[in-house]
């Protein structure tokens, strides 16, 4: 990536890392307003299976692994990207490496959920306080989950699907920060590991993933009021290990693996019309990216 200063623009969709033949160090940003891509400062270490989030206008890359010809190392790293300076800086590492991690943000704190270290599948969860640059363990999930989708709705943290080391999962659970406890919620209609999970209009969406047999293009959403999962329109492409985010009331899914190909496809979901459309392509196909949107 280029090391020049990033243009001072509005909300961008950032995609960090990923995998194609080996873990990648790319940081690129898509501007939905004009359809352009920016090539930004590379991650200091390549990684796939990471998660991305934004706190206080800074982009954080959390966990993952560096799968390269030289070896395969799961990552406990937390790195912070400043869009104003186009530079990465390391932060305090997590207590354990977490590949295929999920993350969510509540009250400016980053929650790192599940993931794997070697063949260990974590149920542990830890919270990062940016002001103190410290991680602290919180209550573990009821289920071990890697390839877990994580979303925050009404200051509650949801962990959806994943893989427990034996089975791909349709179960989901919810963390209550004030009580420091997890509770199971209604299971999805579909087993999904490596799904894209996000929140839009008071619903939790789970897109794609892998059911233990095939990649999925189906999408379902959870209504917290009725506690039910309902299918919406399917994506055009089957994909697991995809990136997902919400931008201006629409869901964007980026890349992933369809069982044959590492996808460069970016699709956008419009909830008003319940339709998916291809909006752009990434500069190259990849799975296992970390994705987030900068705040205004």
């Amino acid at each position: 990536g280029s090391m020049g200063h990033a243009p001072k623009v509005g909300r961008l969709i950032y995609t960090a890392g990923g995998y194609f033949r080996q873990s990648l160090s790319y940081l690129e940003a898509y501007n939905p307003s004009d359809g352009t891509w920016l090539d930004l400062a590379d991650l200091q270490v390549p990684r796939s299976g990471l998660a991305g989030c934004v706190v206080g206008g800074l982009l954080y890359a959390v966990g993952g692994r560096n799968n390269s010809p030289d070896g395969n190392t799961d990552s406990s790293a937390l790195d912070c990207y400043n869009p104003m300076t186009n530079q990465w800086s390391p932060c305090a590492p997590m207590s354990v490496p977490r590949n295929r991690i999920g993350v969510g943000v509540i009250d400016g704190h980053i929650y790192a959920v599940g993931g794997s270290h070697g063949c260990i599948h974590h149920n542990s969860v830890e919270r990062y306080e940016p002001e103190r640059d410290e991680w602290h363990l919180v209550a573990p999930m009821l289920t071990r989950r890697i390839g877990v989708g994580v979303a925050v709705l009404n200051r509650l943290l949801y962990a959806v699907g994943g893989f427990d080391g034996t089975n791909r999962l349709n179960s989901a659970e919810c963390y209550y920060p004030e009580r420091n406890e997890w509770r199971m919620i209604t299971a999805m209609n579909t087993i999904r590991s490596g799904a894209g999970v996000c929140v839009l209009h008071n619903c939790i969406y789970a897109a794609g993933g892998y059911d233990g047999q095939d990649q999925l293009n189906s999408v379902e959403r959870y209504d917290v009021e009725t506690e039910t999962w309902t299918f919406v329109a399917p994506m055009k492409h089957r994909r697991s290990a995809l990136g997902i985010t919400v931008h201006q009331g629409r869901i964007y899914v980026l890349g992933g693996y369809d069982g044959h190909t590492f996808l460069d496809s970016v699709e956008c979901y419009d909830p008003d019309t319940d339709t998916w459309s291809e909006v752009t392509r990434m500069t190259s196909g990849r799975s296992g990216v970390g994705v987030a949107v900068t705040m205004e």
Epitope: Y19, R21, S48, G49, N67, G71, N72, R100, G118, C119, I120, G147, F163, G165, T166, N167, S193, G194, Y210, G212, Q213, D214, Q215, S240, A241, Y257, G259, F262, S287, G288
Partner: antibody, heavy 120, light 107 residues
């Protein structure tokens, strides 16, 4: 019945290339990780490469990284091992095997093996 | 890389004997160890996974156990068809590694 059948082995000169195939039946390769394991004549087993069906990520032994490529074609239910820049020390019987996730990467079904001989 | 040191490299035993083969991991591998049986000219066959779980269809005379980083395959009463070479494998961390094998021969 689950079966794995390797093919594509043979005699090749140092620096040459071969592509091994592993045709699966009785299960979908999209549902299992596929591994290649080799055994040099009179020696033990050496893990070579694997491919994850969920993420598409591949892993390689350091001895073959950059020279070998594992891939899978789910439409043909077949896995492949493309071997380039072959060396004498790559001479071995090559087995493909499947690992079901619940067995913590233990390979529960193996092919019969195909012999690769690298010699001038 | 994690080394799996298997012992003995060979042993002679009689039908009906109790046979024990050990693998020692150079560092913790949790319970991510499998045992295989291989006969000459044939592919390996899975016997034990997750250190102590008997794979389906494998006779109950085979068992596996773990004590820290030491893993043991036991054949409680050796049968004629059990004369073969046995390998342990760790899949705890990349790269997966095998022990060097133990050849069980007829005394």
């Amino acid at each position: 019945e689950v079966q794995l059948v390797e093919s594509g082995g043979g005699l090749v000169q140092p620096g040459g290339s071969l592509r091994l195939s592993c045709a699966a039946s009785g299960f979908a390769i999209s549902a299992s990780s596929i591994h290649w394991v080799r055994q040099a004549p009179g020696k033990g087993l050496e893990w070579v490469a694997s491919i994850d069906p969920e993420t598409g990520e591949t892993l390689y032994a350091k001895s073959v990284a950059g020279r070998f490529t594992i891939s899978a074609d789910t439409s043909k239910n077949t896995a492949y091992l493309q071997m380039n820049s072959l060396r004498a020390e790559d001479t071995a019987v090559y087995y493909c095997a499947r690992a079901e996730s619940g067995n913590v990467a233990a390979a529960d079904y193996w092919g019969q093996g195909t012999l690769v001989t690298v010699s001038s | 890389d994690i080394q799996m040191t298997q012992s003995p490299s060979s042993l002679s035993a009689s039908v009906g004997d109790r046979v024990t083969i050990t693998c020692r991991a150079s560092q913790s591998v949790s319970s991510a160890v499998a045992w295989y049986q291989q006969k000459p000219g044939k592919a390996p066959k899975l016997l034990i996974y997750s250190a102590s779980s008997l794979y389906s269809g494998v006779p109950s005379r085979f068992s596996g156990s773990r004590s820290g980083t030491d893993f043991t395959l036991t054949i409680s009463s050796l049968q004629p068809e059990d004369f073969a070479t046995y390998y342990c494998q760790q899949s705890y961390s990349f790269p997966s590694t095998f022990g060097q094998g133990t050849k069980v021969e007829i005394k």
